[in-house]
Amino acid sequence: MMTGTIETTGNISAEKGGSIILQCHLSSTTAQVTQVNWEQQDQLLAICNADLGWHISPSFKDRVAPGPGLGLTLQSLTVNDTGEYFCIYHTYPDGTYTGRIFLEVLESSVAEHGARFQIP
């Protein structure tokens, strides 16, 4: 039975050329996290495997850095980075939990962090 919830950084915005940390946190479950996938729409950005560690997709190697923790840091942001990002937690024995973050990359310096929210 899946009892866990994923808390994410929610809707966030950042300036073009800057960097942003995408962060999710799984709580309210005793399940063991075996892998976390980070995806942008249908593109795999990175995998953090409990045993093998981090793997960054080759096409994102220059602009994506692992961490902090199970999070992901996006660097040298462009307007094209605007969109949905997903953290997919593979857990034993619960199964898969998914969190969603919407990132807006702004041209100006009016970027503000959105409020945190939960996805059950």
Epitope: M1, T30, A31, Q32, V33, T34, Q35, A50, D51, H90, Y92, P93, G95, T96
Partner: antibody, heavy 121, light 106 residues
């Protein structure tokens, strides 16, 4: 080589306690959940539950609460199963088995060689 | 709880035979099914995960198929070392094993 080595057979009297050990080697102990499986004589496999090797948090399957305790000593990569107030019906082979994984798929591999616990007066 | 029912419970066959073991789940489990082989006095040996993916080192005469509620394990040409008991296991919700299928030499 990834392997699990369990402690030897035990002969116990009803009401006694037993502690079975399962020593892991060849991999990072805290990266893989550990399970316990019971097989009574001539019977099938019964999942007893598992322990989170990151947090030490145990989860017990139905029928295995109360007298059964899973624990860890991560410093020596060892999982333990303790059974208290032993009954004749606890006579069985007890296996530890590591959870293997690929993405969202899981399985048990490897398995320990099994520990026979016999409860008899 | 999800129950797994294996059929047959007992199977007698000869070397070279093609045999199929069926595992039915009481409710849909997608492809979250594994198969194991156990010989007398030994620990179970992992064969297949995700219903059809063969574990490294397992002979190709073993194959698995199915999704949802019905799954099969097939041995295309039985070898002497294949006579054993086979178990299916679901890993979709509250892990359970089938009752086992004992494969004996005819």
């Amino acid at each position: 080589e990834v392997q699990l080595v369990q402690s030897g057979s035990e002969l116990k009297k009803p009401g006694a306690s037993v502690k079975v050990s399962c020593k892991a080697s060849g991999y990072t102990f805290t990266s893989y959940p550990m399970n316990w499986v019971r097989q009574a004589p001539g019977q099938g496999l019964e999942w007893m539950g598992w322990i989170n090797t990151n947090t030490g948090n145990p989860t017990y399957a139905q029928g295995f609460t109360g007298r059964f305790v899973f624990s860890l000593d991560t410093s020596v990569s060892t999982a333990y199963l303790q059974i208290s107030s032993l009954k004749a019906e606890d006579t069985a082979v007890y296996y530890c088995a590591r959870t293997g994984y690929s993405g969202s798929y899981y399985w048990f591999d490897p398995w320990g060689q099994g520990t026979l616990v016999t409860v008899s007066s | 709880d999800i129950r797994l029912t294996q059929s047959p419970s007992f199977l007698s066959a000869s070397v070279g035979d093609r045999v199929t073991i069926t595992c039915r789940a009481s409710q849909g489990i997608s492809s979250y099914l594994a198969w194991y082989q156990q010989k007398p006095g030994k620990a179970p040996k992992f064969l297949i995960y995700a219903a059809s993916t063969l574990q490294s080192g397992v002979p190709s005469r073993f194959s698995g198929s199915g999704s949802g509620t019905e799954f099969t394990l097939t041995i295309s040409s039985l070898q002497p070392e294949d006579f054993a008991t086979y178990y299916c296991q679901q890993l979709n919700s509250y892990l359970t094993f089938g009752q086992g299928t004992r494969l004996e030499i005819k």
